[in-house]
Each structure stands twice: as structure tokens, then as C-alpha cells.
């Protein structure tokens, strides 16, 4: 339940638009967990590019790339009627506003590919 | 190249713990594409959960949660020598401070599941 | 939104090589596999080749496996096709597409949503 059953929520229209935002992050270090190596072992795997940009918060966000056009098989081969697809999610992140240097931000959406998934297509179509 | 290059990087030791924020998304609209049923085609199929929580923003998110231990094969049958294994991604929401109902926020990090992959397994032993 | 401009083509001897180039502006060029598709005088649109969005991974049909080569280059937003002991039967309009969609295989052209205007090669013999 709400802790204050009262709030508007921060969606409705009429919650303020500008809010003060406190960066010390809460669960900084809960959920931390080694270091996937899944990127490897899919049957669909990708390679992790560094995307930074200094007036985003987080400054650097990893990006998945899909190594193949299609799948890996059992033997390590490609399977060109199965394709190797990016998994996106749209998350939030901070943009500085340019005017207001020290501690003005705006929500800002990102289509990030977070790892690749092998599916079936609808149509196979191959030359 | 960064619109204000004196500014202190947001992740700074310096930089100021509490920032404001407009909540006027930025990108509201860019990079919206239709639905994706990658969910269903994919090797890994995964069901989506609605995670609703009125003190966070945004107060819904979707995880995704894989449908079988192995993967499914050519011919639709589960192939227990392969995993069905989440892909996961820390992101970043804002949860409302508890003793400021409108407009005081702190940032705070969530681990989701984004989709499903197919792995192999390190070890092979199937009872 | 991406969008392609391709150049490169020209008019070149049976035999000869030529590289052409797909230059993408939009900050998303990286998120997608790449393609080459062609086009001769009264024929249909047809695949060419595909690389994956790593650029690890490239397909050819059959008619150009062995001759021509995709390769991108992400930090200059560009993608190439070199092709070699060109033919008269290659003479075409060359386009570069970016495939967005996963409905078919590599080579299913509605699968590309985004593609450039194309450039001529004609190989004389």
C-alpha cells in the first residue's frame, strides 16, 4: 500500500512537473550479481558496446548488439531460418537541461537492446 | 561533445545530491515501434508480469519470466540440454521519499527482466 | 529515424570492381542489421546481402557469393559493398536498406523499412 495514501501519483496530470530528486541511489549494491556470461552461451549471442554521453545520467549505458543474422545450432553452426533478435526496453534516464548547469535535469526515454533472443520468423523467405 | 563543459559529470563525488527534475519526458513518442511478439516466437518464450507500485515512477513496469527450464525446438518440443534463462538489466526509477508527499523523489535501482534467451548449459548432466 | 545515402556506382568494364557506400545520419544506425538489395531495368527489387548489427555475421545470395563483400562501419555510420569480377548481369540500381522488422529470414525485403535512393552500376562488356 501507499505510504502516502494521499500523493497524487507522479503520472496524473496534475503532480507537479518539476520535482527534487535525490542521486544517492537506494539499493546501490542489492541485486548485484557476477557478471552474466549469457552474451556468450546464447544460441543468439551479442557483444556489449559502451554508449556514454556526459549530460545523461547514468553517463554510460551498455548496448547489445547481435552478432549474427541468424541462430547458433547445437554444433556451433548458423541457422539462417532462425533469427537473432535484439530484446529492447525503454528506460528512463537524466538529461541536463543546457541552461541550468549544476542540478537541473529532464526525464528523458532510451530504446536500449539489452541481449538477443533467437526467434522464429513468420515468414521464411530464403534466397 | 557536452553542451556545458565546465559542468561537473553528474556522477561526480562533488556533484550536488539533490537535483531538480522536470518529469515532462523528453523522446515521450521517439523510437515507439509496434509491440513486439518476440515473447512468443522466440526459442526462450517468456510471459510478461505487471509490476505496479504507486510510490515509484513509473509505477508500472513489465518483467518477463521464462516459460520453460530448457528451449523449444524446430518441431515445438522442449529441448531440456538447452536453458531458457532471463535476460536481466539494472535500470533506474524514482521512489518517492516517504516524509514529502509531492515532489521529493530518490533515485533507486531496480533489477528486471527484460526477456529470455537460450543458453547451454556449462555443465551437461541431465538425471 | 535513419536515413541512407548511397553512392559508389558507376559505369565500369565487365571484370572490373567498384565499393559502394551507404552513409546513414540518425543515432540509431548501429541498432540494425544492414542490407544491399538491386534492382535491373524491368525486374524486381532482389537481396544482395545482410550484415548483422555487430557486423560479425554477413549473408549473399547465391548470384554474388564469392564477388561481393558487406562490411559497416559504425563509427563512420557506413555501410560498404566491394564488389569484384563484376558482370553485365550485375548492372543494376544498387540500394541500401536497414531491417527494423524479424518477420522473415535476412533476405525478406519488407522486413527493410528504412532505404536510400539508390546508385547506378552498369557493367559493360
Known amino acids: 500500500s501507499p505510504q502516502n495514501p494521499g500523493c497524487p501519483n507522479a503520472e496524473d496530470k496534475n503532480f507537479p512537473r518539476t520535482v527534487m530528486v535525490n542521486l544517492n541511489i537506494r539499493n546501490r549494491n542489492t541485486n548485484s550479481k557476477r557478471a552474466s556470461d549469457y552474451y556468450n552461451r546464447s544460441s543468439s549471442p551479442w557483444n556489449l558496446h559502451r554508449n556514454e554521453d556526459p549530460e545523461r545520467y547514468p553517463s554510460v549505458i551498455w548496448e547489445a548488439k547481435c552478432r549474427h543474422l541468424g541462430c547458433v545450432d547445437a554444433d556451433g553452426n548458423v541457422d539462417y531460418h532462425m533469427n537473432s533478435v535484439p530484446i529492447q526496453q525503454e528506460i528512463l534516464v537524466l538529461r541536463r537541461e543546457p541552461r541550468h548547469c549544476t542540478n537541473s535535469f529532464r526525464l528523458e526515454k532510451m530504446l536500449v537492446s539489452v541481449g538477443c533472443t533467437c526467434v522464429t520468423p513468420i515468414v521464411r523467405h530464403v534466397a | 561533445s557536452p553542451q556545458n563543459p565546465g559542468c561537473p559529470n553528474a556522477e561526480d563525488k562533488n556533484f550536488p545530491r539533490t537535483v531538480m527534475v522536470n518529469l515532462n519526458i523528453r523522446n515521450r513518442n521517439t523510437n515507439s515501434k509496434r509491440a513486439s511478439d518476440y515473447y512468443n516466437r522466440s526459442s526462450s518464450p517468456w510471459n510478461l508480469h505487471r509490476n505496479e507500485d504507486p510510490e515509484r515512477y513509473p509505477s508500472v513496469i513489465w518483467e518477463a519470466k521464462c516459460r520453460h527450464l530448457g528451449c523449444v525446438d524446430a518441431d515445438g518440443n522442449v529441448d531440456y540440454h538447452m536453458n531458457s534463462v532471463p535476460i536481466q538489466q539494472e535500470i533506474l526509477v524514482l521512489r518517492r521519499e516517504p516524509r514529502h508527499c509531492t515532489n521529493s523523489f530518490r533515485l533507486e535501482k531496480m533489477l528486471v527482466s527484460v526477456g529470455c534467451t537460450c543458453v547451454t548449459p556449462i555443465v551437461r548432466h541431465v538425471a | 529515424e535513419v536515413q541512407l545515402v548511397e553512392s559508389g556506382g558507376r559505369l565500369v568494364q565487365a571484370g572490373g570492381s567498384l565499393r559502394l557506400s551507404c552513409a546513414a545520419s540518425g543515432r540509431t544506425f548501429t541498432s540494425y542489421p544492414m542490407g544491399w538489395f538491386r534492382q535491373a531495368p524491368g525486374k524486381e527489387r532482389e537481396f544482395v546481402a545482410a550484415i548483422s548489427m555487430s557486423g560479425d555475421d554477413t549473408a549473399y545470395t547465391d548470384f554474388v557469393r564469392g564477388r561481393f563483400t558487406i562490411s559497416r562501419d559504425d563509427a563512420r555510420n557506413t555501410v560498404y559493398l566491394h564488389m569484384t569480377s563484376l558482370k553485365p548481369e550485375d548492372t543494376a540500381v544498387y540500394y541500401c536498406?536497414?531491417?527494423?522488422?524479424?518477420?522473415?529470414?535476412?533476405?525478406?525485403?519488407?522486413?527493410?523499412?528504412?532505404w536510400g535512393q539508390g546508385t547506378q552500376v552498369t557493367v559493360s562488356s
Open positions: 536498406a536497414a531491417r527494423t522488422s524479424y518477420d522473415g529470414t535476412y533476405d525478406y525485403i519488407d522486413d527493410y523499412s528504412y
